[in-house]
């Protein structure tokens, strides 16, 4: 998929919603300049495209939601990359501009004659994209044209700033809460000295910044902090791993505010360098419970503790999705490419037949095989619902007693739609209430996952806790099986009785050497010895001084 020809999925309607999904992986470093995207993605790509199409079908079949109004969509591929997403967003904008010019009768053919063609309907709002960095770039463009944007997984704290991102909303919480949850886990296990890694880009940078700030306040030290691009080469990952090993055996815990593919890069480097089991990775929701992160590198990932946004599987989506087949699914332009990639076979005689596969796809293939629903599916669907309910509320207030689009609603005013969206309140796919605060953010609840070896060569994610509204609950027995198994990640052990901490110049406050106080000194505080005044002597526990009892010598006393 190169930049010359971008594929788009369309669904007709009275009102068109735009969507940006990462149908393909981001371009590799050597392909960035051509904006040539990587391989097709199932969870983050195809499933989200199908969720958009099917959710709109459900909305359109609901007599209680936008009656007499059909919602359509235009889905574009962001490739999880800012340049590609911006290029695609410009296409959304171009549609809007052409439509508004047409309203004013400005559409003219090249020869100057009037045009009778109907241009595409303008995009009234955009769902996505997934990445925070990409979402920021897209928002910078969309807000110039008053086009509301609802994100389903862009969690960066920066996006809460309405002075900068006025037309941005999200059905997920800000990462500030996630950073807090990670710090709470570190605190729970008394890990006072940890290494830190983050993905270069807004999600990782702002998330790690919050993690470090909160850690400092809790007396947790960062051995060293590193950043890396998700699409960095093997050498970069190997180099990073070597740096992390330099802090062993003290900093065994590595806090990773990372996108999933960054974690995968780390796991692959661990394999190359034979470092499986040396570290415990504490991962943010970029990793969550994704199998595409750990596949093939389970031994390296074992023990990993991850944060996952709470969102149970959407069962009715699976009912729909698992029945899809390439011979009948024509509306998703990426589906044939995906099918061939998923089953590593060739769809003979199909328009998108891929000759790189020798094996021909047989008719018994089904998506049920090794099916894993996108962990953010509930949020994707809630974002689409939000747009529908926002439009519904807008229609109710602008067209009272009228079913359908009235003149007062045409063309749709982005400012009024934003206002309506901010007031939206409905039951989401998980049965929870979806609403937005003054920053356009949604409240958050997290699940704590643990990647474990469940049996010989069988690995899986286990739910071991939750973080809800500042309260961490953990099943310690499930994580560690016994207390003595809890990994230690400390720079220095506590000093013994009568010793003080001496922090070397340039070292963090968690690293010290223990020095005993002199014979006549007591431990004043953990960093200071103080001499007892004349006539007193350190107590047995060396925490203070006692007066030396006065002993009067008599002539006949034996020598002491």
């Amino acid at each position: 998929q190169s930049s010359e020809r971008r594929v788009v999925a369309h669904m007709p309607g009275d009102i068109i919603i735009g969507a940006l999904f990462s149908v393909h992986h981001q371009p590799t470093v050597d392909k960035v300049h051509e904006r040539k995207c990587g391989a097709v993605r199932e969870q983050y790509g195809i499933q989200r495209v199908e969720a958009m199409l099917h959710t709109l079908e459900r909305i359109n079949s609901d007599p209680t939601l936008l009656p007499n109004i059909t919602l359509g969509c235009e889905i574009r591929d962001s490739c999880w990359h800012s340049a590609v997403a911006l290029e695609q967003s410009i296409e959304f904008i171009r549609d809007s501009l052409i439509s508004s010019e047409e309203e004013e009768g400005l559409v003219r053919c090249v020869d100057g004659s009037s045009s009778s063609f109907r241009s595409k309907k303008p995009i009234v709002g955009v769902i996505g994209p997934g990445s925070s960095s990409v979402a920021i770039q897209v928002q910078n463009l969309l807000q110039l044209f008053n086009i509301p944007q609802i994100a389903y997984s862009a969690t960066s704290m920066d996006l809460s700033d309405k002075t900068l991102f006025k037309y941005f909303m999200r059905v997920v919480p800000s990462d500030a809460q996630q950073a807090r949850a990670m710090v709470d886990i570190v605190k729970r296990y008394n890990w006072t000295y940890v290494s830190a890694v983050h993905t270069e880009g807004n999600y990782g940078e702002s998330g790690m910044e919050a993690f470090k700030d909160m850690s400092a306040k809790e007396g947790i030290c960062i051995a060293h902090s590193y950043k890396i691009y998700s699409n960095a080469g093997e050498q970069s990952f190997d180099k990073l791993l070597k740096k992390l090993t330099s802090h062993l055996p003290k900093a065994r815990v590595v806090a990773c505010f990372c996108e999933g593919m960054t974690v995968r890069g780390l796991l692959m480097a661990m394999r190359r360098l034979g470092l499986a089991g040396e570290f415990l990775l504490l991962g943010s929701d970029g990793w969550a419970d994704r199998y595409d992160v750990t596949d093939g590198y389970q031994r390296e990932a074992v023990g990993g503790i991850t944060i996952k946004l709470q969102s149970p599987d959407v069962k009715w989506f699976d009912d729909y999705y698992l029945k899809l087949r390439p011979e009948t699914n024509h509306r998703n332009p990426w589906f044939q490419e995906f099918w061939q990639h998923r089953f590593q076979c060739r769809l003979e005689g199909f328009p998108q037949e891929n000759s790189k596969y020798n094996k021909t796809c047989n008719s018994s293939l089904t998506l049920k095989t090794h099916h894993v629903q996108d962990s953010k599916m509930g949020f994707v669907i809630n974002a689409i619902y939000s747009m529908a309910y926002g439009l519904h509320n807008m229609q109710m207030s602008l067209c009272p007693g009228y079913a359908g689009l009235c003149d007062a609603m045409k063309p749709i005013d982005g400012r009024k739609l934003l206002e309506s969206l901010m007031k939206t309140n409905f039951t989401g796919v998980s049965g929870d209430t979806i609403l937005f605060d003054e920053n356009g953010d949604s409240p958050g609840r997290y699940e704590i996952m643990n990647f474990k070896e469940m049996g010989k060569d069988y690995f899986d994610y286990i739910n071991v806790g939750s973080w809800d509204n500042g309260e961490l609950k953990m099943d310690d027995d499930e994580v560690w099986s016994k207390k003595s198994n809890i990994i230690r990640s400390v720079c220095s052990e506590p000093c013994e009785k009568g010793q003080i901490k001496v922090i070397r110049k340039g070292e963090v406050s968690c690293c010290w050497t223990c020095t005993p106080c002199k014979e006549n000194e007591y431990v004043f505080d953990e960093y200071t010895c103080k001499a007892c005044q004349l006539g007193s002597w350190p107590t047995d526990d060396l925490t203070g001084c006692d007066l030396i009892p006065v002993q009067y010598l008599r002539w006949g006393d034996p020598e002491p």
Partner: antibody, heavy 121, light 110 residues
């Protein structure tokens, strides 16, 4: 307004077959609906049999069906049919056609009046 | 496989009184629960969907609540016309299920 009407119910001998038809009016199958069949034996509760998604033709059956029931649809005729084979006395029931709607998962907001199937020798 | 257990199987209630019917799912159904009323010889009628949303034209005397696996339907100010059998139905999936409906509760109005 929207309506569903079932037909094809009859008195059938055991091991016989039957085709039930549900005709929809007031809405079109070219839109997106899950059309389902539900049955109710005399004096008993509601029992779900099968559904079909009108836009794609994808079919869904209750676990107990075991291939004796086949659901299909015709978008041009706006009909959903249920073919039943190897009938037994236990299949004696009123068979309802129902339409599921919208964002509420599967929720049946429209029902036909039902057609009675009696299996007896 | 999402089994729906409805209690009680039958209940008597006085005119003007309140009755509560419970429905338990074998696993979480994320509030995808509907309630139906069926009178003898008639087709079922949708009362409530999404656990608590009143269907069009249904009296506000009917109230649905619950989440996860536990749900209930309350009918207040009972009228003679409310005598019927009430069914709950899970609407989260139609794959790998035996029956989407609960066993029903017969409500007799005295």
């Amino acid at each position: 307004q929207e309506q569903l009407e079932e037909s094809g119910g009859d008195l059938v001998k055991p091991e016989g077959s039957l085709t039930l038809t549900c005709t929809a009016s007031g809405f079109s199958f070219s839109n997106y609906y899950y059309m389902c069949w539900v049955r109710q034996a005399p004096g008993k509760g509601l029992e779900w049999i099968a559904c079909i998604y009108t836009s794609s033709g994808s079919t869904y059956y209750a676990n107990w069906v075991n291939g004796r029931f086949t659901i299909s649809r015709s978008t041009s005729l706006n009909t959903v049919t249920l073919q039943v084979t190897s009938l037994t006395a236990a299949d004696t029931a009123t068979y309802f056609c129902a339409k599921s709607f919208g964002v509420g998962g599967y929720s049946f907001n429209l029902w036909g009046q039902g057609t009675l199937v009696t299996v007896s020798s | 496989a999402y089994d729906m257990t409805q209690t009680p199987a039958s209940v008597e209630v006085a005119v003007g009184g309140t009755v509560t019917i419970k429905c338990q799912a074998s696993q979480s159904i994320s509030s995808y629960l509907s309630w139906y009323q069926q009178k003898p010889g008639q087709r079922p009628k949708l009362l409530i969907y999404r656990a608590s949303t009143l269907a069009s034209g249904v009296s506000s005397r009917f109230k649905g609540s619950g989440s996860g696996t536990e749900y209930s339907l309350s009918i207040s100010g009972m009228e003679c016309d409310d005598a019927a059998t009430y069914y709950c139905q899970q609407g989260t999936t139609i794959s790998d299920v035996d029956n989407v409906f609960g066993g029903g509760t017969e409500v007799v109005v005295k």
